[in-house]
């Protein structure tokens, strides 16, 4: 799977949105998960409503919202009052019985309200052994990344 | 009426090639997963494989990984199971199935099975 | 992988008579099974689904219960037709497992 970039501002809402094949995954419920480093688990944040049927309901975890389209094939994740340490790896997932189907890995990246004057250091950025190949950039204005790029500009 | 109606039963010697397959029809063969289970002889019932024919994304058991390949064909709504190189061990009862997932369980079971292909591998 | 263990492996029974098969996982599977009928020289048939819930055109006889790693079916009340192998199967994660059946016989 290629990475997609989201990148919202600091203290406003972000939506990731999440295509699938609609009648390959119809019945399967789905998931919010936040990847533990890069070869780590994927630790569950929010998931759809316990009947299917009832997907297109928003579900709430603390700030994070989901919702399925079941028929058009697009789970939509909103996270409100977006924080710089929400900023990180995440996916979407298709569940079946206890295992999970990647639908879609999502970096988010968190940029400084340009009308806030705090301290730019509180922002996240990736670690010099964080970076993600392939990565597609989904925010006002998309770009790819060229294979191999980082995503964020140095912290330094 | 769903029906998946497999190729007819096969002999072959150790070492040569064989493809069998599973044609569905009376439903929408791409939107649904279809398995493979293999019977041993007066044996149970073991899964080797799952393939979706809408992308052909396909799933092994770590049993037949790499013994077997699973591929589909949705244009003429047909899957196929095949060997490249039979052993006597590979003597069994093949059958399809269709996965259908049940939307208040998100799990998926088999719900209509093919007739079964009878291989036999012998020398 | 998950082991699904079945007991008995086979059980002599008559018409009328209530039977019950179990089926234990080797790990929790939630409610994540199903059973299937097969008979001599035929493909399974799914009679079971979710641990409890009947397939479409399955007769009330059949009932399913259990959760976790106990599972158990129960036929009410045997008819000739019943006479077959029945095989437990795990849907909780890949690779799917089966049972190794249960052969219920006439006495």
């Known amino acids: 799977h290629n990475t997609t970039v989201f990148q919202g501002v600091a203290g406003q809402s972000l939506q990731v949105s999440c295509p699938y094949d609609s009648m390959k995954h119809w019945g399967r419920r789905k998931a919010w998960c936040r990847q533990l480093g890069e070869k780590g688990p994927c630790q569950r944040v929010v998931s759809t409503h316990n009947l299917w049927l009832l997907s297109f309901l928003r579900r709430w975890n603390g700030s994070t919202a989901i919702t399925d389209d079941t028929l058009g094939g697009t789970l939509t994740i909103t996270l409100r009052n977006l924080q710089p340490h929400d900023a990180g790896l995440y996916q979407c997932q298709s569940l079946h019985g206890s295992e999970a189907d990647t639908l879609r890995k999502v970096l988010v990246e968190v940029l400084a309200d340009p009308l806030d004057h705090r301290d730019a250091g509180d922002l996240w950025f990736p670690g010099e052994s964080e970076s993600f190949e392939d990565a597609h950039v989904e925010h006002s204005i998309s770009r790819s990344l060229l294979e191999g790029e980082i995503p964020f500009p140095p912290t330094s | 009426e769903v029906q998946l109606v497999q190729s007819g039963a096969e002999v072959k010697k150790p070492g040569e090639s064989l493809k069998i397959s599973c044609k569905g029809s009376?439903?929408?063969?791409?939107?649904?997963?279809i398995a493979w289970v293999r019977q041993m002889p007066g044996k149970g019932l073991e899964w080797m494989g799952t393939?979706?024919?809408?992308?052909?994304?396909?799933r092994y058991s770590p049993s037949f990984q790499g013994q077997v390949t699973i591929s589909a064909d949705k244009s003429i709504s047909t899957a196929y199971l095949q060997w490249s190189s039979l052993k006597a061990s590979d003597t069994a009862m093949y059958f399809c199935?269709?996965?259908?997932?049940?939307?208040?369980?998100?799990?998926?079971?088999?719900?209509?099975w093919g007739q079964g292909t009878l291989v036999t591998v012998s020398s | 992988d998950i082991q699904m263990t079945q007991s008995p492996s086979s059980v002599s029974a008559s018409v009328g008579d209530r039977v019950t098969i179990t089926c234990r996982a080797s790990?929790?599977?939630?409610?994540?099974l199903a059973w299937y009928q097969q008979k001599p020289g035929k493909a399974p048939k799914l009679l079971i689904y979710?641990?409890?819930s009947r397939q479409n055109g399955v007769p009330s006889r059949f009932s399913g219960s259990g959760s976790g790693t106990d599972f158990t079916l129960t036929i009410s009340s045997l008819q000739p037709e019943d006479f077959a192998t029945y095989f437990c199967?795990?849907?909780?994660?890949?690779?799917?497992?089966f049972g190794q059946g249960t052969k219920l016989e006439i006495k």
């Open positions: 199935a269709r996965s259908r997932t049940f939307y208040y369980d998100s799990s998926d079971y088999f719900d209509y």
């Open positions: 009376g439903y929408s063969f791409r939107s649904y997963w």
């Open positions: 393939i979706y024919p809408g992308d052909s994304d396909t």
């Open positions: 790990q929790g599977i939630s409610s994540w």
């Open positions: 979710a641990a409890s």
């Open positions: 199967q795990q849907a909780d994660s890949f690779p799917r497992t």
